[in-house]
Amino acid sequence: SERCDDWGLDTMRQIQVFEDEPARIKCPLFEHFLKFNYSTAHSAGLTLIWYWTRQDRDLEEPINFRLPENRISKEKDVLWFRPTLLNDTGNYTCMLRNTTYCSKVAFPLEVVQKDSCFNSPMKLPVHKLYIEYGIQRITCPNVDGYFPSSVKPTITWYMGCYKIQNFNNVIPEGMNLSFLIALISNNGNYTCVVTYPENGRTFHLTRTLTVKVVGSPKNAVPPVIHSPNDHVVYEKEPGEELLIPCTVYFSFLMDSRNEVWWTIDGKKPDDITIDVTINESISHSRTEDETRTQILSIKKVTSEDLKRSYVCHARSAKGEVAKAAKVKQKVPAPRYTVELACGFGAT
């Protein structure tokens, strides 16, 4: 056949849908690969063709749009399942073409099973709520386009396995779930089940997301350098190992880049000739505040190294700070035999 622009298998868009529920899947060509939309393509005489490869098969085959009750159908650039079955799992391809033009992309679709408590292999989106920040809401995701605005669905919210009713600080409000004051105890998986009628049938959409309560911007502070500090002195003899930890606490800030770095005599360690190694570790608190530790290590320190300035720097969206380590050469204890000899006038 003639050449077709093949965008390959778009694994970035690993689509997961629940078994026995409706699913509407838009052809990714118009969303991510082409500079025009479906309407423009359609009016230019281009046709959208769908086909698929079953799981564990190599054979591409057309999608059967003649199933009972139109279980699988296509509408504009959307492939519909009403509802899905487990064996719909596979790689789906949408191809846009006419006699002179062809472009196609494939994407994986996985139909997953859930248990009665909504546990499943589904990758869950994470919604971050600020701790003790006033009323915040989450919205039942990815339900647009399933039913017309004239249809009024029923929505039931669950936390884990439990229907949300008479909860202290969590109130269901239709498609929204309101958190009056988010607390750590609100961390968990929340599920909305949307039930709506269509052509005499009842369909359910199940959407689960993870709520993570994080540090509030009103509590956020510039980076805090815990060490080095004024209370600690690194007193070393030449030949000993010098280890200086720089430990920095970063408040959680949405989309902030936290950075820690050392300078030695005002230069980055990479730009100087001494043999320095730096190891970093990162830990997080339950509200996603971050502690970064960078340990500066000089295996065999020289007397020159002990005269240098060692400064730890830290930066976040809240500001930049720096702190110098107190490094000095250990004064050797006086040797008794030498002092005694000097006392007797030896030269």
Epitope: V221, V224, H226, S227, N229, H231, I244, T247
Partner: antibody, heavy 123, light 112 residues
Framework: QVQLVQSGAEVKKPGASVKLSCKAS????????MNWVRQAPGQGLEWVGQ????????YYAQKFQGRATLTVDTSTSTAYMELSSLRSEDTAVYYC????????????????WGQGTLLTVSS | DIVLTQSPISLAVFLGQRATISCRAS??????????MHWYQQKAGQPPKLLIK???DLESGVPVRFSGSGSGTDFILNIHPVEVEDIATYYC??????????FGGGTKLEIK
């Protein structure tokens, strides 16, 4: 996870010395202050001192200055407390406890504690 | 040195009721933005366990029935509703500057 495991119970005579150990795991030992706190039978908590393992910097409560010595072995992530010139009033459970890091640059809390070592001083 | 005075020395409350423990410092342990006052729970035969740090911040894994408040010299630990597993001795602790660490004398909580 963070763990502080202390050495076993000790019985000593007055005037003797004792060296208690506290082995840390689950975190970067050299970057956190290690404290020692004691508790006499039926009494409250009393802070002995603290050490910063990366540098060996130490601070002591005035009461223990000169009699308590805090050291570390960074190769085994172990902290030690040596107490000399023991007297019967030193009979207590001795705890090691780590300071935490938080959004403030001082005033640290003690977030992890060892299980304690009972020291009995008796003639 | 800063002295911490806890009151009462012992406290007996009914299950489900509120327990309030007070800690007074001989001088302020607060600075701009925070108070270096912490609360610990110690059950018989166990090491202390950090409950609240910096006067009001609940430590990870501690039930929300524990809360702390106060600044300057006066601090409060509240437990509500009290449960059987809360039977313990509670200590306040300040760490105002290095190296001055002191503890309150403790408050023993019992169930009526």
């Amino acid at each position: 996870q963070v763990q502080l495991v202390q050495s076993g119970a000790e019985v000593k005579k007055p005037g003797a010395s004792v060296k208690l150990s506290c082995k840390a795991s689950g975190y970067i030992f050299i970057t956190y202050w290690m404290n020692w706190v004691r508790q006499a039978p039926g009494q409250g908590l009393e802070w002995v001192g603290q050490i910063f393992p990366a540098s060996g910097t130490t601070y002591y409560a005035q009461k223990f200055q000169g009699r308590a010595t805090l050291t570390v072995d960074t190769s085994t992530s172990t902290a030690y407390m040596e107490l000399s010139s023991l007297r019967s009033e030193d009979t207590a459970v001795y705890y090691c406890a780590r300071t935490d890091f938080y959004r403030y640059d001082g005033g640290y809390a003690l977030d992890y504690w060892g299980q304690g070592t009972l020291l009995t001083v008796s003639s | 040195d800063i002295v911490l005075t806890q009151s009462p020395i012992s406290l007996a409350v009914f299950l489900g009721q509120r327990a309030t423990i007070s800690c007074r410092a001989s001088q302020s342990v607060s600075t701009s933005g925070y108070s270096s006052m912490h609360w610990y729970q110690q059950k018989a035969g166990q090491p202390p366990k950090l409950l609240i740090k910096y006067a009001s911040d609940l430590e990870s894994g501690v039930p929300v029935r524990f809360s702390g408040s106060g600044s300057g010299t006066d601090f409060i630990l509240n437990i509500h509703p009290v449960e059987v597993e809360d039977i313990a001795t509670y200590y306040c602790h300040h760490s105002w500057g290095i190296p001055m660490y002191t503890f309150g004398g403790g408050t023993k909580l019992e169930i009526k």
